[in-house]
């Protein structure tokens, strides 16, 4: 807390300019008028004053604004905002997109801080939708964004926002989750060949039905296993032994290694074991040789 | 994190010349604003000059004329070129950086200037 003191002689700002920056603390509290500079905050980003000075600067506001800032500050905070607190920002009304952008823009290149995580959370309550504007923008700036958001939020994803997404990015969705994004990145990669659309269309996978899965297997693709454990279980099911081999390629002898873990678990007790046999890799528990395989679930549509 | 280590400050006489440096080391490419402060013998600590990462630059009015800033980004290394130094320039000079991923200065240990006949 900065010691107030009379403002010297001559050293009132009458407006919000870099000869401030020279100021010491208490010279800034004791001369720089709460309401100019809340009227002038657009010109405090332009000056590079030093976190000490922000915190002085910052402690003005909050004495002018104890109910929270209006958005025309809130909009002009640039490096300010760095240093509110999630409680800081709980008390904010943000609507525009503009303000959300420019101070998305501060933290731009960085992990996601709780202070951005509640500036959202405040800015998604306030416009009451999650609209395609701000995903776009959202998306833009955090493409992890993604998978905290619910199955009925991410419907409302563009596919275009899709190409912004990193693998790691949905290293945390579920596959709930995944099985909403994955028919809009099949979309958004449809113009792609073959190879590249692989690479694109890989982390995804986690939302791919079987019929996907099957025409990838005719595309030489060599999934590695990686990629074919985060697979739905029943979208990996119906897949034959050969449709398993085309699609992993080389990869295939890493199943092994798996087959005590779903879905490779499951899928081997779907399988012949004369089929499993020509793999080559000693994989046990597929149906005995001369066993009839009944469809229960097609038995109880019939009755 | 942000280390900075400075050096080249030492006892001069009145007239005289020196240039200071200060060495930046850890997450350099955060780095946003480089600033020199200084301390004088019972007083506070002032603000000397500054530069920016896009170049721009200013020194106090006291030192305007005299002290010059300046930054190779390459090394990481801030200078400052002080000439026709007087006995009140005698303290001693910080550097310290503001960074754009954590709202906190950084600072180095400071160097000792002594401007003495």
């Known amino acids: 807390e900065v010691e107030k003191t009379a403002c010297p002689s001559g050293k009132k700002a009458r407006e919000i300019d870099e000869s401030l920056i020279f100021y010491k603390k208490w010279e800034l509290e004791a001369c720089v008028d709460a309401a100019l500079l809340a009227t002038q905050m657009d010109r405090v980003n332009a000056i590079p004053f030093t976190y000490e000075q922000l915190d002085v600067l910052k402690h003005k506001l909050d004495e002018l604004y104890p109910q929270g800032y209006p958005e025309s500050v809130i909009q002009h905070l640039g490096y300010l905002f760095l240093k509110m607190s999630p409680e800081d920002i709980r008390k904010w009304n943000v609507t525009s997109l503009e303000t959300l952008k420019a101070l998305l823009e501060v933290n731009k290149g960085h992990e996601m801080s709780p202070q951005v995580a509640t500036l959202i959370d405040r800015f998604v309550k306030g416009r009451g939708q999650l609209d395609k504007d701000t995903l776009d923008t959202l998306t833009a700036f955090y493409p992890g964004y993604l998978c905290s958001l619910s199955p009925e939020e991410l419907s409302s994803v563009p596919p275009s926002s899709i190409w912004a997404v990193r693998p790691q990015d949905l290293d945390t969705c579920d596959p709930r989750q995944l099985d909403v994004l994955y028919p809009k990145a099949r979309l958004a990669f449809q113009n792609m060949n073959g190879s590249e659309y692989f690479v694109k269309i890989q982390s995804f996978l986690g939302g791919a039905p079987t019929e996907d899965l099957k025409a990838l297997s005719q595309q030489n693709v060599s999934m590695d296993l990686a990629t074919f454990m985060k697979l739905r279980t029943d979208a990996v099911l119906p897949l034959t032994v050969a449709e398993v081999q085309k699609l992993l390629g080389p990869h295939v002898e890493g199943l092994k290694a798996e087959e005590r873990h779903r879905p490779v678990r499951d899928w081997i007790l779907r399988q012949r074991q004369d089929d499993l046999d020509t793999l080559g890799l000693g994989l046990q528990g597929g149906i005995p040789n001369g066993y009839l395989v009944l469809d229960l679930s097609m038995q109880e549509a019939l009755s | 994190e942000v280390q900075l280590v400075e050096s080249g400050g030492g006892l001069v006489q009145p007239g005289g010349s020196l240039r200071l440096s200060c060495a930046a080391s850890?997450?350099?490419?955060?780095?946003?604003?480089m600033y020199w402060h200084r301390q004088a013998p019972g007083k506070e600590r002032e603000l000397v000059a500054y530069?920016?990462?896009?170049?721009?630059?200013n020194v106090a009015d006291s030192v305007k004329g005299r002290f010059t800033i300046s930054r190779d980004n390459s090394k990481n290394t801030l200078y400052l070129q002080m000439n026709s130094l007087r006995a009140e320039d005698t303290a001693v000079y910080y550097c310290?950086?503001?960074?754009?991923?954590?709202?906190?200065?950084?600072w180095g240990q400071g160097t000792l200037v002594t401007v003495s006949s």
């Open positions: 310290s950086v503001r960074t754009t991923s954590y709202p906190v200065d950084f």
């Open positions: 850890g997450r350099t490419s955060t780095i946003d604003t």
């Open positions: 530069v920016t990462s896009r170049g721009t630059s």
